[in-house]
């Protein structure tokens, strides 16, 4: 069967028909609809939105749309006992308290159920003590404090600015340093772009705005009480003491008005260098404690949030494939938001909705994709990627045998400057080819391709004339599919100019001010960037589901493997004495990469030449392509991170958002000079080189001729 037997539309026309059906005005309408009230995970409002999406996807023409529910651990503030931070005097009197809520934006003053700013999964507690300012609370910040400045955080409350790394890593680092509480705040240096007004007059963060977010260190586990298995009706749940990834010290977020009040009194050591100074009019002294006149004052945290097992709902829509219904291409993004979700996630959910509508329109005209497309509206992403992970755990046997690709669809925009893509190397050529066929929405690039504007604005650091494509890290719903199951994955969105805007993320991220109006007034009034992202995401799904030969190029994996091997070798060679002493050799890894390169090249030649009309041979070649990503999975996982199983990529151990290449070797080498037993440490480096070399060689062999 050819992929066109189920339709009277030619393949080229299919893609054109699909893309032409996508409309900016619809995305705008859907975004408005999804952002009028909060849709916090575990709430009735978010359940109602799940049912609405289920109903609309059915109307759009999908074959089936089901709700998949799970009972997972979530976290909420206590409605009658609010969280806050105080400065207390020597008598214990509270002489300053942080705000209990964000001032609501215009037009939303009467909206109920706006969850106040909190750090999800913080334990309860009322610690009091001296403050230590720890910059971004990165690994290197604590090294600077402890090793260079000899400042001890043990028994202190630390205050850290948001940005640079995932907030859960900040909390983990503070715990390891012995802190008894963490205050997170948004510094204007990171969340207030110069020359732009605060919301509602611009897209900057006002002083009362606060970033919510979870502070877990799940390392891919999903629901903290049911790691590895779905949180279904008959689940066995761990006790809270054995739960995965929960923080052990109280944590709370504040805005920069409140942060000013805490930081202006700081004494102790001066900041070590200018990289520790933000933009507030405070000295950015590290502490510990307050300066002279205020030295008897302390900081006290009041945290009363509770962890509760709560029902969540994914929406799973199916468009059955005409030729290979047992091959799944998945488009998924989350639905739950911290408050209104103007950008995160509803700018993504609105795009998914329009993509479903377009596919549904084609299906109603008699068309079907070659392969099955699954659409997902995930719940509880903000609480640790819970909905996607539980569903993947429940369906892991199907996914590992049938999963072709996963395309993520969270926020469509984090700026309006250029495209940003993170994906498996297998998808590089797909992304390049697709963006060459799409029109750029950028001013000054009228009549030019998206590829051209993207390449001009975000050039590859290695290859001239090509755009930058980044490694997948984590912090979003592709994690379980890529890092645990080894399903080829990708994500695309419009982003800011990273060179001129050094703030972290976008200023209003996870605040009450992330509204429909923020997008419609300031980011994308014409919704042209949303439309472009819909075309990229939808186009990728279309090609993955419909092309006769899967649009994966294994030669691009060979190129990056060589680059990553070069990089990790260079890191290791910074310890030449130990390399020599312990006979640490990268020969096996370079040899495996060489073999992979040669075998991938031969496979690509066979892919050009084979008889595509022979369905058995076609399926065989496609299976080799589909299973290549799977071949990089080590069933034993990474050390102490069993759900991160991809040997080539993992979220950085120091920043969940960032991807690290050859993570096993990288982590074994990290700070190796401080290890108490160098022989054991370098033995682990050698073991990790062995695991990586074996995995690359084994993956190469999956591309060899089968007999």
């Amino acid at each position: 069967k050819s992929s066109n037997e189920a339709t009277n539309i030619t393949p080229k026309h299919n893609m054109k028909a699909f893309l032409d059906e996508l409309k900016a005005e619809n995305i705008k309408k859907f975004l408005y609809n999804f952002t009028q009230i909060p849709h916090l995970a575990g709430t009735e409002q978010n359940f109602q939105l799940a049912k609405q999406i289920q109903s609309q996807w059915k109307e759009f023409g999908l074959d089936s749309v089901e709700l998949a529910h799970y009972d997972v651990l979530l976290s909420y503030p206590n409605k009658t006992h609010p969280n806050y931070i105080s400065i207390i005097n020597e008598d214990g009197n509270e002489i300053f308290n942080t705000s209990l809520f964000e001032p609501p934006p215009p037009g939303y003053e009467n909206v109920s159920d706006i969850v106040p700013p909190f750090s999800a999964f913080s334990p309860q507690g009322m610690p009091e003590g001296d403050l230590v300012y720890v910059n971004y609370a990165r690994t290197e910040d604590f090294f600077k404090l402890e090793r260079d400045m000899k400042i001890n955080c043990s028994g202190k409350i630390v205050i850290a600015r948001y940005g640079k790394v995932f907030r859960g890593n900040k909390v983990k680092n503070a715990q390891l340093a012995g802190a008894k509480g963490v205050i997170l705040y948004s510094d204007p240096a990171d969340y207030f772009a110069p020359g732009v007004k605060s919301y509602p007059d611009g897209w900057n963060l006002p002083g009362g705005g606060v970033q919510r977010g979870n502070i877990l260190n799940l390392n891919g586990a999903g629901d903290p009480l049911t790691p590895g298995y779905p949180a279904n009706e008959y689940a066995y749940r761990r006790g809270i003491a054995e739960a995965v990834g929960l923080p052990s010290i109280p944590v709370h977020p504040i805005g920069y008005y409140d942060a000013q009040k805490l930081l202006e009194k700081m004494g102790g050591s001066a900041p070590p260098d200018s990289s520790w100074r933000g933009s507030l009019k405070v000295p950015y002294n590290v502490g510990p404690g307050f300066t002279g006149n205020f030295s008897t004052q302390k900081v006290k945290m009041h945290i009363h949030s509770t962890n509760e097992v709560t029902r969540i709902y994914n929406v799973i829509g199916t468009l059955r494939g005409a030729v290979e219904p047992d091959r799944y291409v998945i488009l998924g993004g989350h639905r739950d938001s911290w408050v209104f979700g103007g950008i995160d996630p509803q700018s993504g959910a609105a795009v998914v909705h329009e993509i479903v509508r377009s596919f549904g329109t084609l299906k109603k005209e008699g068309w079907r994709p070659r392969r099955t497309i699954l659409f997902a509206s995930w719940d509880a992403e903000e609480f640790g990627l819970l909905g996607s992970t539980e569903w993947a755990e429940e369906n892991s046997r199907l996914l590992q045998e049938r999963g072709v690709a996963y395309i993520n669809a969270d926020s469509s925009i984090e700026g309006n400057y250029t495209l940003r893509v993170d994906c498996t190397p297998l998808m590089y050529s797909l992304v390049h080819n697709l963006t060459k066929e799409l029109k750029s929405p950028d001013e000054g690039f009228e009549g030019k391709s998206l590829y051209e504007s993207w390449t001009k604005k975000s050039p590859s650091p290695e290859f001239s004339g090509m755009p930058r494509i980044s490694k997948l890290g984590s912090g979003n719903d592709f994690e379980v599919f890529f890092q645990r199951l080894g399903i080829a994955s990708g994500r695309a969105r419009y982003t800011k100019n990273w060179e001129t805007n050094k703030f972290s993320g976008y200023p209003l991220y996870h605040s009450v001010y992330e509204t429909y109006e923020l997008v419609e007034k300031f980011y994308d009034p014409m919704f042209k960037y949303h439309l472009t992202v819909a075309q990229v995401r939808g186009g990728m799904v279309f090609e993955l589901a419909n092309s006769i030969v899967l649009p994966f190029d294994c030669r691009d994996y060979a190129v990056v493997l060589r680059k990553y091997a070069d990089k990790i070798y260079s890191i290791s060679m910074k310890h030449p004495q130990e390399m020599k002493t312990y006979s640490v050799s990268f020969d096996s890894l370079f040899s495996a990469v060489k073999n992979f390169t040669e075998i991938a090249s031969k496979f690509s030649e066979r892919l050009q030449d084979f008889d595509k009309s022979n369905p058995i041979v076609l399926r065989m070649m496609n299976d080799q392509l589909m299973f290549l990503e799977r071949a990089f999975i080590d069933p034993l996982g990474l050390p102490d991170r069993p759900f991160y199983r991809h040997v080539i990529y993992a979220p950085s151990s120091h920043n969940k958002y960032a991807g690290e290449s050859f993570p096993g070797i990288y982590d074994a080498l990290f700070d190796i000079e401080s290890k108490v037993d160098p022989s054991k440490a370098w033995g682990e480096v050698k073991r990790q080189i062995y695991v990586a070399a074996f995995t690359v060689q084994a993956a190469a062999e999956t591309l060899s001729e089968v007999a």
């Epitope: 060589r562 990089k567 060679m573 030449p576």
Partner: nanobody, 113 residues
């Protein structure tokens, strides 16, 4: 059998330049990243620079950044280290290294007035 043969060392005045070469044989040269490592008299080994498969992928120790340039010619199976603005503290035996375990015999660079 892997062989790495360094050359180009010698005596040079501070501020002067030298170009070291490392001729390689016995392995698929272009398939390996390579490094320069040095050992100053009475000191331990110190990494200087590494290079990947092409001249884009390079890395340098802070002590030599901006003064030294590593490069390779895959057609000639040769690794190079161009050393400019040499300092007294650059005096050392310079080794070419493949994969971490295969080392050349080294070439002596002496920077002295």
């Amino acid at each position: 059998e892997v062989q790495l043969l360094e050359s180009g060392g010698g005596l040079v005045q501070p501020g002067g330049s030298l170009r070291l070469s490392c001729a390689a044989s016995g392995f698929s040269f272009s398939s390996y990243a390579l490094s320069w490592v040095r050992q100053a008299p009475g000191k331990g080994l110190e990494w200087v620079s590494s290079i990947g498969e092409n001249n884009h992928t390079t890395d340098y120790a802070d002590t030599v950044k901006g003064r030294f340039t590593i490069s390779r010619d895959n057609s000639k199976n040769t690794l190079y280290l161009q050393m400019n603005s040499l300092r007294v503290e650059d005096t050392a035996v310079y080794y070419c290294v493949k994969d971490g375990v295969h080392w050349g015999q080294g070439t002596l660079v002496t920077v002295s007035s």
